[in-house]
């Protein structure tokens, strides 16, 4: 039986040009995590991350996608054509895949501030 | 330039082990993740497992998970791969290769080293 | 485990051919796929990696493509020295698994 949540950042907006944190956070399971898969809205990949082997970062994104803090993704150097979902995919065992969901808006505003804040979807 | 000299042919009975070695240099050991496959004559390649010099972490493949293990000795540059209870299916090639920083594909392979299990 | 089915196992063609092979993947790999050449008594070399992207080094003619389930490997034309056998390997999740490779001689 699944019991874990996925808590993520939620709706997030942040400045074109500048950088953003992605993150999720696996609770409420004792299940070890395997690997964790971040996709973007078109669900391509944009990195993996395998507990024991380490980041795989996709070419694509290789500029501009560093990793971590932990298990989330740091994206930087926004454009306008980042405005969209990402999902972070956990895989764990015993209790299978979990899935959780950011929306991420850029911002032509040189005001815009960055708000994250975590949620369960 | 990025080197893997693996150690040389070995040939053993079933049920011994054998221990293969990988010495690596032209790069910073620890950087990359170190992965073992073996090919038996006329197959596929098989992927064993992969260890994490930085960590020591370690991720097999469930048909070898008991009978395989992977260790590093940073100092020295070197992974090893040994497995146990050999039995004549194990005959083999075996080879080292690392993985792309930040990439998962096989950029850099060892020569191989034949392992023969024959009674 | 996802199982990764190649084709055709063999393929005779001659020096100048568009040559072409196919890998199929038994569960969606995103574009989580790379191709090996390895010639006879040699270890495998790298040639394509993430599915489509030239490693460093690789001529111009061999190319990738595909993602999901679907991958092909172009050779766009066949060379002497490209007689090899050929494999795909995806490393979406572990265990890490290769195709069982596409033998290719010259006619």
């Known amino acids: 039986m699944m019991t874990g949540t996925i808590e993520t950042t939620g709706n997030i907006s942040a400045k074109k040009g500048g950088s953003v944190i992605l993150q999720c956070h696996l609770s409420s399971t004792m299940a070890q995590v395997t690997q964790v898969n971040w996709e973007q809205h078109d669900h391509s990949l944009l990195a993996i991350r395998n507990a024991e082997l380490g980041w795989h970062i996709y070419p694509a994104f290789k500029d501009r996608v560093a990793p971590g803090p932990g298990l989330g993704l740091t994206l930087q150097s926004l454009t306008m054509n980042d405005t969209g979902e990402y999902f972070c995919t956990y895989h764990t065992y015993p209790d299978g895949t979990y899935r959780g969901r950011i929306f991420l808006e850029v911002l032509e505003s040189s005001v815009a501030e960055h708000s994250a804040r975590f949620q369960i979807p | 330039q990025v080197q893997l000299v693996q150690s040389g042919a070995e040939v053993k009975k079933p049920g011994a082990s054998v221990k293969v070695s990988c010495k690596a240099s032209?790069?910073?050991?620890?950087?990359?993740?170190m992965h073992w496959v073996r090919q038996a004559p006329g197959q596929r390649l098989e992927w064993i497992g992969g260890?994490?010099?930085?960590?020591?972490?370690?991720s097999y493949s469930q048909k070898f998970q008991g009978r395989a293990t992977l260790t590093v000795d940073t100092s020295a540059s070197t992974a090893y791969m040994e497995l146990s209870s050999l039995r004549s299916e194990d005959t083999a090639v075996y080879y080292c290769?690392?993985?792309?920083?930040?990439?998962?594909?096989?950029?850099?392979w060892g020569q191989g080293t034949t392992v023969t299990v024959s009674s | 485990d996802i199982q990764m089915t190649q084709s055709p196992s063999s393929l005779s063609a001659s020096v100048g051919d568009r040559v072409t092979i196919t890998c199929q993947a038994s569960?969606?790999?995103?574009?989580?796929l790379a191709w090996y050449q390895q010639k006879p008594g040699k270890a495998p070399k790298l040639l394509i990696y993430?599915?489509?992207y030239r490693y460093t080094g690789v001529p111009s003619r061999f190319s990738g493509s595909g993602s999901g389930t679907d991958f092909t490997f172009t050779i766009s034309s066949l060379q002497p020295e490209d007689i090899a056998t050929y494999y795909c390997?995806?490393?979406?999740?572990?265990?890490?698994?290769f195709g069982g490779g596409t033998k290719l001689e010259i006619k």
């Open positions: 260890i994490n010099p930085n960590q020591g972490g370690t």
């Open positions: 290769t690392r993985s792309s920083y930040y990439r998962y594909d096989l950029d850099y």
């Open positions: 032209g790069y910073t050991f620890t950087e990359n993740a």
């Open positions: 390997h995806q490393h979406y999740t572990t265990p890490w698994t």
């Open positions: 569960q969606d790999i995103k574009t989580a």
């Open positions: 993430s599915a489509s």
